[in-house]
Interface confidence: low
């Protein structure tokens, strides 16, 4: 996804509209595309991004990545479509409630990346695995 | 059990103010976007407001737009509307409904408050 | 905004009957498509969403169908706690707008 084309400010947040005005209402996301990150040896960090969208497009669903090189870590906040590759990888875990990285190769830098289909679940990501089965939040969402 | 209460509601004088409530429990509120909707006696539903699971975007009906703000306050699992320069029109019951979280449903409010009714007349 | 209509706005049917009640947007919605049952002095129901998916909890005599600008919920058997008004629902674009609903009453 293209960073919003067209905002209404409102709190402080983005809301994204399309050409006729309409508001896409399905999902809403973390969207500060590329930021600077102190996120580093934790279990799970706050995206720290203070602008929420709703995503262009309904099928969009909320998308972070981080990135970290020998000059620094970024964390990027975004929509996309599921069925489009991002970063050349596919989003695997788009149905999932919650925002759990996974390392991909990528030569140079070390990469993990998450997707996820609750409203604004990009704010929070998850590096520990034992959120996979053991988080009760987590487990609530999938089965209540 | 998921259950949504609201408080609030009453009789009002137009031009007034009114804020109502909504009491959230059985679920963890602060993941999930929340709306607002009304119906008017004897009429059909209309939706008035949604607000982000973090409070940070909000939507309005045009309706009420500029005249009604809708809030919450997670620490207390609670969501507001706060309604000023109130009409005769804006009399109706008004609901609180949570918004779905699952992918498919996004958008479908599954569950609703047993609703408050505000009249606004002289 | 997108316009929903609903029709009919009123039935009378039996207990037994088959019962359908067609929605239309003013614009393709996708899926994006919600019904809900609401009876008097009582908060709506979710029954439908996703144009065709069954909430939990709710009998299997309740279908929908639909995509695009034209929708169905089809009741197959009428049962007496059935008799209420439903509302559908475009979830595709903010207002999330309701038909002006389909009153089912006994015959």
């Known amino acids: 996804t293209i960073p919003p084309h067209v905002q209404k400010s409102v709190n402080n947040d983005m809301i994204v509209t399309d050409n006729n005005g309409a508001v896409k209402f399905p999902q809403l996301c973390k969207f500060c595309d590329v930021r600077f990150s102190t996120c580093d040896n934790q279990k799970s960090c706050m995206s720290n991004c203070s602008i929420t969208s709703i995503c262009e497009k309904p099928q969009e669903v909320c998308v972070a990545v981080w990135r970290k090189n020998d000059e620094n870590i970024t964390l990027e906040t975004v929509c996309h479509d599921p069925k489009l590759p991002y970063h050349d990888f596919i989003l695997e875990d788009a149905a999932s409630p919650k925002c759990i990285m996974k390392e991909k190769k990528k030569p140079g830098e070390t990469f993990f990346m998450c997707s996820c289909s609750s409203d604004e679940c990009n704010d929070n990501i998850i590096f520990s695995e034992e959120y996979n089965t053991s988080n009760p939040d987590l487990l609530l969402v999938i089965f209540q | 059990e998921v259950q949504l209460v609201e408080s609030g509601g009453g009789l009002v004088q137009p031009g007034g103010s009114l804020r109502l409530s909504c009491a959230a429990s059985?679920?963890?509120?602060?993941?999930?976007?929340m709306t607002w909707v009304r119906q008017a006696p004897g009429k059909g539903l209309e939706w008035v407001s949604v607000?982000?699971?973090?409070?940070?975007?909000?939507y309005y009906a045009d309706s009420v737009k500029g005249r009604f703000t809708i809030s919450r306050d997670n620490s207390k699992n609670t969501l507001y509307l706060q309604m000023n320069s109130l009409r005769a029109e804006d009399t109706a019951v008004y609901y609180c409904?949570?918004?779905?979280?699952?992918?498919?449903?996004?958008?479908?409010?599954?569950?609703w408050g047993q609703g408050t009714l505000v009249t606004v007349s002289s | 905004d997108i316009q929903m209509t609903q029709s009919p706005s009123s039935l009378s049917a039996s207990v037994g009957d088959r019962v359908t009640i067609t929605c239309r947007a003013s614009?393709?919605?996708?899926?994006?498509l919600n019904w809900y049952q609401q009876k008097p002095g009582k908060a709506p129901k979710l029954l439908i969403y996703?144009?065709?998916s069954l909430q939990s909890g709710v009998p299997s005599r309740f279908s929908g169908s639909g995509s695009g600008t034209d929708f169905t919920l089809t009741i197959s058997s009428l049962q007496p706690e059935d008799f209420a008004t439903y509302y559908c629902?475009?979830?595709?674009?903010?207002?999330?707008?309701f038909g002006q609903g389909t009153k089912v009453e006994i015959k």
């Open positions: 409904a949570r918004r779905s979280q699952y992918r498919d449903k996004v958008g479908a409010t599954d569950y």
């Open positions: 059985g679920f963890y509120f602060d993941i999930y976007a």
């Open positions: 607000i982000s699971g973090s409070g940070g975007t909000t």
């Open positions: 614009q393709s919605i996708s899926s994006y």
């Open positions: 996703a144009a065709s």
């Open positions: 629902q475009q979830s595709y674009s903010t207002p999330p707008t």
